[in-house]
């Protein structure tokens, strides 16, 4: 079953290479278990770059190799990538899966076109 | 640096499937990331897909998304490419890569440092 995901349309990532940005979706029933991934759709791919699934109420858990991090408030998700540099601006997508109790939802935003600038470097000092 | 071999390609009607495999030995599978590319008569080489250390993460070209799908076998060393409604463009050498790298944004970009002898998956129509 289809179900509505709400993200900003463009975040800016600071200085050090870090995005955040909110995923809210429109809970049709009580899920107790939620799986949310972040997509990035660019050059011509699309890549999962990270997932996590998380009871609600408590912590979100990340699969390996992730440079997410998150914590969730109700039907809302706070996500934060990191490390970001120039080549990463792209779309990425917040995906919502209501994985607990049955029926299973399926919720995909129209993605977070993410911008980053890396910093110049310091001029040297005399 | 790890040792891959690919097997599985052969030649295809138009709509046809295939399973190409790649066998790793020599270094901890796990901690690589694994990815295949392909490479057609006249072409560069071109990013078909990856698959992160546990297997939990994927991308994708768009060229192959909802048809080709990547997986792993760590125990056995494995990485799998499993092709479905092939079509002639998808003609080409396969190869499998290994990158001794965290997953990330970008894995088609990675430094892939080992790569297997590829194989040939030719589709007819």
């Known amino acids: 079953k289809a179900m509505h995901v709400a993200q900003p349309a463009v975040v800016l990532a600071s200085s050090r290479g870090i995005a955040s940005f909110v995923c809210e979706y429109a809970s049709p029933g009580k899920a107790t278990e939620v799986r949310v991934t972040v997509l990035r759709q660019a050059d011509s791919q699309v890549t999962e770059v990270c997932a996590a699934t998380y009871m609600m109420g408590n912590e979100l858990t990340f699969l390996d190799d992730s440079i997410c991090t998150g914590t969730s408030s109700g039907n809302q998700v706070n996500l934060t990538i990191q490390g970001l540099r120039a080549m990463d601006t792209g779309l990425y997508i917040c995906k919502v899966e209501l994985m607990y109790p049955p029926p299973y939802y399926l919720g995909i935003g129209n993605g977070t076109q993410i911008y980053v600038i890396d910093p110049e470097p310091c001029p040297d000092s005399d | 640096e790890v040792q891959l071999v690919e097997s599985g390609g052969g030649v295809v009607q138009t709509g046809g499937s295939l399973r190409l495999s790649c066998a790793a030995s020599?270094?901890?599978?796990?901690?690589?990331?694994m990815g295949w590319f392909r490479r057609a008569p006249g072409k560069d080489r071109e990013f078909v897909a990856a698959?992160?250390?546990?297997?939990?993460?994927?991308a994708y070209a768009d060229s192959v998304l909802g048809r080709f799908t990547i997986s792993r076998d760590n125990a056995n060393e494995m990485a799998y490419l499993q092709m479905n409604s092939l079509n002639p463009e998808d003609t080409a050498v396969y190869y499998c890569?290994?990158?001794?790298?965290?997953?990330?944004?970008?894995?088609?970009?990675?430094?892939?440092?080992?790569w297997g002898q590829g194989t040939q998956v030719t589709v007819s129509s």
């Open positions: 890569a290994a990158a001794p790298v965290p997953w990330g944004t970008r894995p088609s970009h990675f430094t892939y440092d080992s």
């Open positions: 020599g270094r901890t599978f796990s901690m690589y990331t």
């Open positions: 698959i992160s250390r546990s297997g939990g993460l994927k």
